[in-house]
Interface confidence: low
């Protein structure tokens, strides 16, 4: 006869490990007992359990409530045991020694491998600002046994670097993702992907990128000169910019206070019916936590009644 077993048994932390040991013999052969031992290079061989054809199962007190036979129906030639709720300390070599009649004794060894699936954590880097050089966007750490694989899944252009720290029973892997921040990256997902043989599927943690920036400011509203004549209503200047965080807008007049009746509403400066008093240099000041920008325009309100200021449409054409 011979023993049917496995060279390596692999389980995930907390699962039950089936240690296989089946005697394949002639029909008239019988298994008297199966002795299970833990084989430790330092502590030698320690009893785990004894399966006896008459006396039943005996379990070493150190493994009380943790070692069982597989549920019935059981083949009398099957000496397999279940090691409940495997922990990392269970990793190592195990031996089954089968005593048969009349063929004698057989033994086999196997290695139990306990996988510790990682629980990854993602840490964003320092605040990202447009104009910075290569900057840490995020780091992702995962510890497990064996060492997990940590990679990044993103459309964003960047570089990744990994480092490992080996502990007695596990390994921690940290991967960093560096990039050169630009406003186009705002809102883009950066996903840490952790792979491990103890995981049915990759674990993914997504970080949404936030890049602080402030665009140049410009002013719109002076395109149609006909709107800027004395008496016209509804004239406005609009300040154009964008940023993250969203910017605040402030309007001033370079050569004095804003004329009475002029209303500021966020990025827009609204004028009452125009008079020549509204002529002047207006400044839009845009700012957020990152920076500030200015844009200034000169408003000239024309008086059609003033011959000196009239436009000669004939010569202009």
């Amino acid at each position: 006869g011979e023993l049917e077993t496995s060279d390596v048994v692999t389980v995930v932390l907390g699962q039950d490990a089936k240690l296989p040991c089946f005697y394949r013999g002639d029909p008239d052969e019988q298994v008297g007992q199966v002795a299970w031992a833990r084989v430790d290079p330092n502590e030698g061989i320690r009893e785990l359990a004894l399966l006896h054809s008459k006396y039943g199962l005996h379990v070493n007190p150190a493994y009380e409530d943790r070692v069982e036979q597989p549920p019935p129906p059981r083949d009398p030639l099957d000496g397999s045991v279940l090691l409940r709720n495997a922990v990392q300390a269970d990793e190592g070599e195990y031996e089954c020694r089968v005593s048969t009649f009349p063929a004698g004794s057989f033994q086999a060894r196997m290695r139990l491998r306990v996988l510790v699936p990682p629980l990854p954590s993602l840490n964003p880097g320092p605040p990202l600002e447009e104009g910075q050089g290569l900057t840490l966007a995020a780091s992702c750490t995962a510890e497990g046994s064996p060492a997990p694989s940590v990679t990044w899944d993103t459309e964003v252009k960047g570089t990744q670097s990994s480092r490992s720290f080996t502990h007695p029973r596990s390994a921690a892997v940290t991967s960093e993702f560096h990039l050169v921040p630009s406003r186009s990256m705002n809102g883009q997902p950066l996903t840490c992907v952790v792979s491990h043989p103890g995981l049915l599927q990759d674990r993914r943690i997504t970080h949404t990128l936030q890049v602080a920036f402030l665009a140049e400011a410009s002013v719109r509203g002076l395109e149609d000169q006909n709107l800027w004549q004395v008496g016209r209503e509804g004239a406005t200047l609009k300040c154009l910019s964008e940023g993250q965080p969203p910017p605040k807008y402030n309007w001033t007049r370079l050569d004095g206070p804003l004329p009475s009746g002029v209303r500021v509403k966020g990025d827009t400066l609204g004028f009452p019916p125009l008079t020549t008093e509204h002529s002047g240099v207006y400044v839009c000041h845009v700012s957020n936590e990152l920076s500030s920008r200015d844009s200034q325009v000169t408003v000239e309100v024309l008086d059609p009644e003033d011959p000196g200021k009239q436009v000669d449409l004939v010569s202009a054409s």
Partner: antibody, heavy 123, light 107 residues
Framework: EVQLVESGGGLVQPGGSLRLSCAAS????????MSWVRQAPGKGLEWVSA????????YYADSVKGRFTISRDNSKNTLYLQMNSLRAEDTAVYYC????????????????WGQGTLVTVSS | DIQMTQSPSSLSASVGDRVTITCRAS??????LAWYQQKPGKAPKLLIY???SLQSGVPSRFSGSGSGTDFTLTISSLQPEDFATYYC?????????FGQGTKVEIK
């Protein structure tokens, strides 16, 4: 079809004992962690206790530690909650629920719940 | 223990409304967050697990979002059968803890 059926609730005096059972069917019972969650009348949900698939690990809320004992019999597909030294504030509907082990002591959310059994502690 | 703070504690809405419930954890819990629906006299029913994954058999009008400490449950178009109490629960650490619940009532 997954089914969890609680039983054993009833009226008990303060200081008394009660044993709740939860009969499971439709899934491999020993592969799942099991929990007890309670709900006092008109109140929210409160986790009480949990036990790993093998029964080797047990967990308790501080409010019941030392008074309640969770156990399971995987051969009978049954979860138990032994409740001793009962107090008025233990009055609640008690639900059993199942969850899967991910790794370490981290479990999934409870995807199936029983219909609950009412425990009333009053003199 | 991790505290879970849900808001609002109750809300009134009409059929077809978009409803949003928020849940805040007292410390980071990654995405170890579940949302449950409970109707009077019934057991809780799992709607969302892992913060944003829809449990099998749950209508797609339910959605979840968030990670870390701040989470949201959204019902895109409230249906008559959605009037119930909703709970968030963290299972990042033991003991797992629930929010105090949000009762969604008919306006």
């Amino acid at each position: 079809e997954v089914q969890l059926v609680e039983s054993g609730g009833g009226l008990v005096q303060p200081g008394g004992s009660l044993r709740l059972s939860c009969a499971a069917s439709g899934f491999t019972f020993s592969s799942y962690a099991m929990s007890w969650v309670r709900q006092a009348p008109g109140k929210g949900l409160e986790w009480v206790s949990a036990i790993s698939g093998s029964g080797g690990s047990t967990y308790y809320a501080d409010s019941v530690k030392g008074r309640f004992t969770i156990s399971r019999d995987n051969s009978k597909n049954t979860l138990y909650l032994q409740m001793n030294s009962l107090r008025a504030e233990d009055t609640a509907v008690y639900y059993c629920a199942r969850a899967e082990l991910l790794a370490f002591d981290v479990y999934t959310a409870s995807d199936y719940w029983g219909q609950g059994t009412l425990v009333t502690v009053s003199s | 223990d991790i505290q879970m703070t849900q808001s609002p504690s109750s809300l009134s809405a009409s059929v077809g409304d978009r409803v949003t419930i928020t849940c805040r954890a007292s410390q980071g819990i990654s995405s170890y967050l579940a949302w449950y629906q409970q109707k009077p006299g019934k057991a809780p029913k799992l709607l969302i697990y892992a913060a944003s994954s829809l449990q099998s058999g749950v209508p797609s009008r339910f959605s979840g979002s968030g990670s870390g400490t701040d989470f949201t449950l959204t019902i895109s178009s409230l249906q008559p059968e959605d009037f119930a109490t909703y709970y968030c629960q963290q299972h990042y650490t033991t003991p797992p803890t629930f929010g105090q619940g949000t009762k969604v009532e008919i306006k």
